[in-house]
């Protein structure tokens, strides 16, 4: 029986050009975490395996850094990074737990506020 739950940072936003930490935490289970996969809309970003450590997908290696912990740091954000991210926890003996994070990358806080608070 799977008793665990995944806690995530939920919906988050960050500025274009900046960085963000994607973080998930598995709780309420004594299952052993054997591997965590980080995915973005049917694309593999990175894997952290208990035995093998981290593997970053070649196409993301310049912009993705492992950690902190089992989390993932995205750097040099672009608006194309907006979307859903998934942390997939492979555990023994429970099986697989999945968490979801939605990231919105904003052009900039100045542009964001400028659109709403124009000086007459």
């Amino acid at each position: 029986m799977m008793t665990g739950t995944i806690e995530t940072t939920g919906n988050i936003s960050a500025e274009k050009g900046g960085s963000i930490i994607l973080q998930c935490h598995l709780s309420s289970t004594t299952a052993q975490v054997t591997q965590v996969n980080w995915e973005q809309q049917d694309q593999l970003l990175a894997i952290c395996n208990a035995d093998l450590g981290w593997h970053i997908s070649p196409s993301f290696k310049d912009r993705v850094a492992p950690g902190p912990g089992l989390g993932l740091t995205l750097q040099s954000l672009t608006v194309n990074d907006t979307g859903e991210y998934f942390c997939i926890y492979h555990t023994y003996p429970d099986g697989t737990y999945t968490g979801r994070i939605f990231l919105e990358v904003l052009e900039s806080s100045v542009a964001e506020h400028g659109a709403r608070f124009q000086i007459p």
């Epitope: 591997q35 049917d42 894997i47 395996n49 035995d51 593997h55 196409s59 023994y92």
Partner: antibody
Framework: EVQLLESGGGLVQPGGSLRLSCAAS????????MHWVRQAPGKGLEWVAA????????SYADSVKGRFTISRDNSKNTLYLQMNSLRAEDTAVYYC???????????WGQGTLVTVSS | DIQMTQSPSSLSASVGDRVTITCRAS??????LNWYQQKPGKAPKLLIY???SLQSGVPSRFSGSGSGTDFTLTISSLQPEDFATYYC?????????FGGGTKVEIK
Amino acid sequence: EVQLLESGGGLVQPGGSLRLSCAASGFTFSSYSMHWVRQAPGKGLEWVAAINSNAGSSSYADSVKGRFTISRDNSKNTLYLQMNSLRAEDTAVYYCARVPYGVWMDYWGQGTLVTVSS
Amino acid sequence: DIQMTQSPSSLSASVGDRVTITCRASQSISYYLNWYQQKPGKAPKLLIYAASSLQSGVPSRFSGSGSGTDFTLTISSLQPEDFATYYCQQSYSTPLTFGGGTKVEIK
């Protein structure tokens, strides 16, 4: 350098048994899942069986379930495939493969030929 | 079981040609798709993993794309050493399954 070396193949009669071995070197064997894949003469690739890094779990193709057993000895850096009740359709080259992160087969052995015939 | 359908089953091409091989899964497999090259009498060799990641040491003329059910292996400029059989393989769920293979022959 990663190396996988299969052995134990040969000619066996239908209903007979064989045990294949795959000797691993050049990497930390105990950290990797390992798989067996076979290829009948002139045919494509067929996955046979898999075992995780600590031998805690294994899985099999339906075509070999109940007849083949995958195992490993991490102290000897060796993977095994015990094949019982062999049939003519088991005739193939058997490859062992290393599977990092459970997703892709990055290194393969050279294969060992199993021929089941009377 | 997830069925993997490769097309074409064979093709003839010339050195320098752009070659495209497709693989279709019977259900969505996300990015869990790998491509292998096999030459006669030799073991398969990993080319592309996780749909689009180039395996270390593999020439950049090989590329992979796709997700879900439809995937493509592209060789941008075919070289003499690329004449071989290519297989796709899903690792989304067991039993792992391979496509039937695509034999790339010299025209």
